[in-house]
């Protein structure tokens, strides 16, 4: 893996220490020939969680175009999911316009959908 990236199970991961909105985070990953992390299994979930710590962090899952989709095209419906209870809820009550279209790790690793413009940390992934 490149310097400052961490290898696990055939992928390399980079963990940010600053925050960006989801679209900017995905663009950052793309500039590194990577994408926001696609969580494919319980073991990968735990690995990422260990490195991220108890911090909100964007992952490569969005429903901005309708159904939930992983950024690399991995099938969402048949794949791994770790939503927190009652999530995703596309909550409009924040009063900031629209619902919640981007997924992130919460403090305990469970997933939540949130406004894509929130400046959360993020995780990039690329194949080794």
């Amino acid at each position: 893996c490149p310097v400052n990236w961490v290898g696990y199970e055939g992928s390399c991961y980079w963990f940010s220490r600053s925050g960006k909105p989801w679209p900017e985070a995905e663009k950052y990953c793309q500039l590194e020939n990577a994408h926001l992390v696609v969580v494919g299994s319980w073991e990968e979930q735990k690995f990422i969680q260990h490195h991220v710590g108890p911090v909100n962090s964007w992952i490569g899952l969005t429903d901005q175009s309708g159904p939930w989709k992983w950024v690399d095209g991995t099938d969402y419906e048949s794949g791994f999911k770790n939503w927190r209870p009652e999530q995703p809820d596309d909550w409009y009550g924040h009063g900031l316009g629209g619902g919640e279209d981007c997924a992130h790790f919460t403090e305990d690793g469970g997933w939540n959908d949130d406004i894509c413009q929130r400046p959360y940390r993020w995780v990039c992934e690329t194949q080794r």
Epitope: S41, E43, G79, F80, N82, R84, E107, G109, G110
Partner: antibody
């Protein structure tokens, strides 16, 4: 050595609730997820969900959502599994099990819950 | 949900025999599969994790292989204490699911 010690057998009437405990020792309780698995008499194994003892976060199998509650008390390194609105087909041995690498590496001895009128 | 199937459902064998049990997942689970042994009235015991890694303290006559959808547990030389039910379990995604079990009994 790692040990998970569960509470004793219970007999409940249909519609009642039960709460099973699982006391952990031999490792740092808050470092590992704990799962609950049940096994009806003469049947196979069925995963019910997990709790993260550090955060209290849970993930329940859809089949049990609305009836199961998993909690923990970190001060005594104990996890609990509550199941409500019991039916006769909830009669089973209930196990707690520690999360390992793609597995459950340590199991409690099991708690038999019998639901009978 | 990912469905797990096992074959055979039961096998009669003698001490010293080589026994092979197969497990199939309804969709790919990489190598995230475990094997357990269960004896009557006891909790399951972990034998193999990550499809092929031997759990500490488990005899080396047990081995596992496979990836994706097809997996195998092999007992190279069956011992008297090995007569039990064996379950596979996928730990790739929720809900975690188990195979129906394979009973290994004395011929």
């Amino acid at each position: 050595q790692v040990q998970l010690v569960q509470s004793g057998a219970e007999v409940k009437k249909p519609g009642a609730s039960v709460k099973v405990s699982c006391k952990a020792s031999g490792y740092t309780f808050t470092d590992y997820y704990l799962h609950w698995v049940r096994q009806a008499p003469g049947q196979g194994l069925e995963w019910m969900g997990w709790i993260h003892p550090n955060s209290g976060g849970t993930n329940y199998a859809q089949k049990f959502q609305g009836r199961v509650t998993m909690t923990r008390d970190t001060s005594i390194s104990t996890a609990y599994m509550g199941l409500s609105s019991l039916r006769s087909d909830d009669t089973a041995v209930y196990y707690c099990a520690r999360d390992g690498t793609s597995s459950f590496d340590y199991w409690g001895q099991g708690t038999l819950v019998t639901v009978s009128s | 949900d990912i469905q797990m199937t096992q074959s055979p459902s039961s096998v009669s064998a003698s001490v010293g025999d080589r026994v092979t049990i197969t497990c199939r997942a309804s969709q790919g689970i990489s190598r995230w599969l475990a094997w357990y042994q269960q004896k009557p009235g006891k909790a399951p015991k972990l034998l193999i994790y990550g499809a092929s890694s031997l759990q500490s303290g488990v005899p080396s006559r047990f081995s596992g292989s496979g990836s994706g959808t097809d997996f195998t547990l092999t007992i190279s030389s069956l011992q008297p204490e090995d007569f039990a039910i064996y379950y596979c379990q996928q730990a790739n995604s929720f809900p975690f699911t188990f195979g129906p079990g394979t009973k290994v009994d004395i011929k």
